[in-house]
């Protein structure tokens, strides 16, 4: 059998096979050693017994999407049945005091590979034996501690495969310079050691994407905005836009990145090299935000211009390959190509509470003695829309330990002036956070207040 017979049906075109050679990967036309690495179809009854105590699940993730030319990293994590884990020696052991369907196990090991390899290795002096090889016959690399690596991972994409010896978690990075744009499929088959052979334990596949567009995401933040994820913001307060470029392999680290903004409110184009920008909308309504990101990234060199046509025919100087103009196309050329990313969002701008201030605090004199508590009135003004809710959070003087939170609907007059009355149990210094909210906004003000003993002579004061 060949690798492509074993590893999946998604066979790319001959064009891909010829042109998309991945560095360090091999063609899936190579032969697969079925004696050492048996192949089981989906639904084969043998899968049931491929692992002691249940099924192993392989989880394949990637940091896709990848900008063409950058590296994409795939990670495979094995999830063992309940109560099982890999120990420092690479053996699979039962977790202490963990009870599964079979109860507590007397044998600490699920798989004691250390013992197996000591018993069965029959190696020559080099530490190499006929069974310490990958499915294509290549010997295992002898990294320090390689004997503790008991899983064989075979990655397969674009008609090529990559073999890796590992523990319960492995990572593989692939350069995408030669990968066709668009969605691609990565398949991984995982084997475990089994005496002098290997047993399949899991198969997993995942789609990854290679793109020529810079993957761009914009976060938006605005003070007093109640919900930053609904793309509804407040008039007359700056919104901070922060551009996040998905570049996990740092491909664009040395690129100059330009950001071109159109906020959709007839304020024109704004060009910057900074990934953050502030913008204030001064009208209510719906606006179309557009961002174009431009970066000069390493990329393929353009083909050389054709040689100038001589006016008179001249004898050929030799084969076309000797043309001196072609000598500039050496493999190590460092050409740049402009890559672009786009982000578009529809932003709704509404009225909101812009500001809240405590302008006065008064100790409410009670008609009867009540030594345990004080009633304090906070006279509050606000700017912007009509608040519907007031919350007070009363905490210790450091404003860290909350003692009491009270929220209630509030009725506000046309001037946005209201009085909030709160009870303070006992004298002392308190931190008061007061927020006014409506459907879209939440405005906060804070003050330190010193509540005196219930002696009429002691005045209420704002603490500094």
């Amino acid at each position: 059998k060949r690798f492509h017979d074993v590893l999946g049906n998604e066979r790319p075109s001959a064009y891909m096979r010829e042109h998309n050679q991945l560095n360090g990967w091999s063609s899936d036309e190579n032969d697969w050693n079925e004696k050492l690495y048996p192949v089981w179809k989906r639904g084969d009854m043998r899968w049931k017994n491929s692992w002691k105590g249940g099924r192993v699940q392989a989880v394949l993730t990637s940091d896709s999407p990848a900008l063409v030319g950058s590296n994409i990293t795939f990670a495979v994590n094995l999830i063992f049945p309940r109560c099982q884990k890999e120990d420092a020696n690479g053996n699979i052991v039962y977790e202490k005091n963990c009870r599964n369907e079979a109860g507590l196990s007397a044998d600490p090991y699920v798989y004691n590979w250390t013992a197996w390899s000591e018993d069965s290795d029959g190696e020559n002096g080099t530490g190499q034996s006929h069974h310490n090889v990958f499915p294509d016959g290549k010997p295992f690399p002898h990294h320090p501690g390689w004997r503790r690596w008991n899983f064989i991972y075979v990655f397969h994409t674009l008609g090529q495969y990559f073999q890796k010896l590992g523990r319960c978690s492995v990572r593989v990075s692939v350069n995408t310079a030669n990968v066709t744009l668009g969605p691609q499929l990565m398949e991984v088959t995982v084997y475990r050691r089994h005496g002098r052979a290997y047993v399949p334990i899991a198969q997993v596949k995942d789609v990854y994407v290679v793109t020529d567009q810079i993957p761009v995401f914009v976060t938006m933040f605005q003070k007093n905005d109640r919900n930053s994820s609904d793309e509804t913001f407040l008039k007359d307060l700056p919104i901070m836009f922060d551009v996040l470029i998905h570049d996990p392999s740092h491909f664009l680290n040395y690129s100059t990145i330009n950001y071109k903004w159109s906020f959709g409110d007839n304020t024109g184009l704004f060009v910057s090299t900074n990934h953050t920008v502030n913008h204030t909308y001064v009208l209510n309504g719906t606006f179309s935000l557009n961002l174009t990101v431009k970066a000069a990234a390493p990329g393929p060199c353009p083909p050389p211009p054709p040689p100038p046509r001589p006016s008179k025919p001249t004898p050929s100087l030799g084969p076309a390959g000797d043309n001196p103009l072609e000598l500039s196309r050496i493999p190590d050329e460092n050409c740049q190509i402009n890559r672009y990313g786009h982000f578009q969002a529809t932003i709704t701008i509404v009225e909101g509470i812009l500001e809240v201030n405590i302008i006065q605090m008064t100790d409410v004199l009670m008609p009867v003695p009540w030594p345990e508590s004080s009633l304090i009135d906070f006279v509050v003004t606000c700017q912007g829309s009509i608040p519907t809710e007031v919350c007070t959070i009363i905490s210790d003087p450091t404003c860290e330990i909350t003692q009491n939170t009270v929220c209630s609907p509030v009725d506000v007059d046309e001037m946005c002036l209201l009085t909030v009355r709160r009870t303070f149990n006992g004298s002392g210094t308190y931190c008061v956070n007061l927020t006014l909210g409506d459907d879209t906004s939440l405005a906060l003000t804070s003050t330190l207040i010193s509540v005196p003993d219930r002696d009429p002579a002691s005045p209420l004061r704002m603490a500094n």
């Epitope: 519907t388 009491n404 209630s408 009085t419 009355r421 709160r422 409506d438 459907d439």
Partner: antibody, heavy 116, light 111 residues
Amino acid sequence: EVQLLESGGGLVQPGGSLRLSCAASGFTFIRRPMSWVRQAPGKGLEWVSSISHSGGSKYYADSVKGRFTISRDNSKNTLYLQMNSLRAEDTAVYYCARKWSTFDYWGQGTLVTVSS
Amino acid sequence: QSVLTQPPSASGTPGQRVTISCSGSSSNIGNNYVSWYQQLPGTAPKLLIYADSQRPSGVPDRFSGSKSGTSASLAISGLRSEDEADYYCGAWDSSLNAYVFGGGTKLTVLG
């Protein structure tokens, strides 16, 4: 002069639905929260629901949560209460009231009777 | 059973001073404004006191409200026969996220 006029009450069978309306005049409706309060025959007042000036914030009594829906049409200066899955214990005079931290103006009420 | 507790009835003779109490907790009366409502027989309720002790315009100064900790009270001085009505206290409850009323007090003017 502030005026609140309820309508839509009547006799309905258990499990049935009814929609109450409250027409407001004499004040800037769009700037005020509004509420519904009910009073069962011979019993005390029970708050039912409140809605903010824009309609974005709504509060309900536990006894009606999931069955009643408060809404408003600011262009028509009208408050609504959609009542579904009505029960015998919802029988009451339903009052429309202005504001929600205190009820400073009340309508005359509309009687809802839930009976088979 | 109401969240706010009022005496079911109170009485007094004309000219007398009568006080109606309303007891709650820190989540309602203790940290939110108390209102008082008057309901004359066969009519809709009417706001009598708001913000613990404020009178809306048109309400005689014979009616006064006060609050102490988690209790509030309504005082009516110079009692008149037209004051015979049901009186309800009310406040927002921040724990229940609901407006709560007392069970009501039936005031009878004797004589």
